[in-house]
Interface confidence: medium
Amino acid sequence: QEEDLPRPSISAEPGTVIPLGSHVTFVCRGPVGVQTFRLERDSRSTYNDTEDVSQASPSESEARFRIDSVREGNAGLYRCIYYKPPKWSEQSDYLELLVKESSGGPDSPDTEPGSSAGPTQRPSDNSHNEHAPASQGLKAEHLY
């Protein structure tokens, strides 16, 4: 009998509100034994797959997708899914990335604290979305 795959979680570092031109890293987490993580961008039906999976803890694996310089077009909903042979997991909850103009004021923090979306139940459409051009170093600039 095949094991039930737990839903992945998604988080953003350093947070979900990112100043224009700053960096953000999406972190997808799942159980050990994950072969491929996929970061999906909902609004444009794009995604990227990576096998660059590391062990985050004895019971968790993770993959990191970095955007070096956030643009307005990067704002939107993101979610994770993973492949653990021989099947795909359900999608994670959505995480919304907000991009703001850099004000530079001393009272305005650059980012909100790290935010995550765990395995809370919500409808998912299970559609396979578009691959986008890839580059070395797990960059996710193309997810916009």
Partner: antibody, heavy 120, light 110 residues
Framework: SSSVEESGGRLVTPGTPLTLTCTVS????????MGWVRQAPGKGLEWIGT?????NTYYASWAKGRFTISKTSTTVDLKITSPITEDTATYFC????????????????WGPGTLVTISS | ELVMTQPPASVSAAVGGTVTINCQAS??????LAWYQQRPGQPPKLLIY???TLASGVPSRFKGSGSGTDYTLTITDLECADAATYYC????????????FGGGTEVEIK
């Protein structure tokens, strides 16, 4: 410059296992996925399988169980486990365009091919 | 199983003319499509990837287009050297016959 070259193609009898080797130069197998594609005489291209930088392997449904792809630091092997006459073809080794993203799994660099003949 | 269909098997056109080659996927492959040129006795050569991006060194006479399940390779200002067989290939989902080729279309230059 980067190159790939296949070797090991020869005439074998049906059922005799055969291993083809792809030797790469000018780039590292830790940075690129690699694939095997074959072409029967006068026919089209057939994808057999791909091996990732993490040595995960992906096969065409018709090739599962019939072929095994593996690699070392400088070579990629294709083993035909129990050849049949229909496996007679030129076998190409090809380099993917990148590494961990599936969107880089098209083939940007090809070897000249090696001819395999299966006949009794 | 992902199947790539590439009709017709052959097409003929004159030097200086234009030829259009079609490729259809059995499911949405979201522009994860490459085109290759293969001349007799040679290995394939990458022309286009991501449905419309020209590979390095490929003349702009070659143009890829399409989305969803339907894709097209258009060659304009045909030259004698363009006589070859052209293949489409997807690299959509590696878990499901993800790198299937079309059957090929032979281009004859009159």
């Amino acid at each position: 410059s980067s190159s790939v070259e296949e070797s090991g193609g020869r005439l074998v009898t049906p059922g005799t296992p055969l291993t083809l080797t792809c030797t790469v130069s000018g780039f590292s197998l830790s940075s690129y996925v690699m694939g095997w594609v074959r072409q029967a005489p006068g026919k089209g291209l057939e994808w057999i399988g791909t091996i990732s930088i993490r040595s995960n392997t992906y096969y065409a449904s018709w090739a599962k169980g019939r072929f095994t792809i593996s690699k070392t630091s400088t070579t990629v092997d294709l083993k035909i486990t129990s050849p049949i006459t229909e496996d007679t073809a030129t076998y190409f080794c090809a380099r993917g365009a990148g590494n961990v993203y599936y969107s880089d799994y098209y083939f940007s660099l090809w070897g000249p091919g090696t001819l395999v003949t299966i006949s009794s | 199983e992902l199947v790539m269909t590439q009709p017709p098997a052959s097409v003929s056109a004159a030097v200086g003319g234009t030829v259009t080659i079609n490729c259809q996927a059995s499911q949405n492959i979201y522009s994860n499509l490459a085109w290759y040129q293969q001349r007799p006795g040679q290995p394939p050569k990458l022309l286009i990837y991501k449905a419309s991006t020209l590979a390095s060194g490929v003349p702009s006479r070659f143009k890829g287009s399409g989305s969803g399940t339907d894709y097209t390779l258009t060659i304009t200002d045909l030259e004698c050297a363009d006589a070859a067989t052209y293949y489409c290939q997807t690299y959509y989902n590696m878990m499901d016959d993800g790198a299937a080729f079309g059957g090929g279309t032979e281009v004859e230059i009159k």
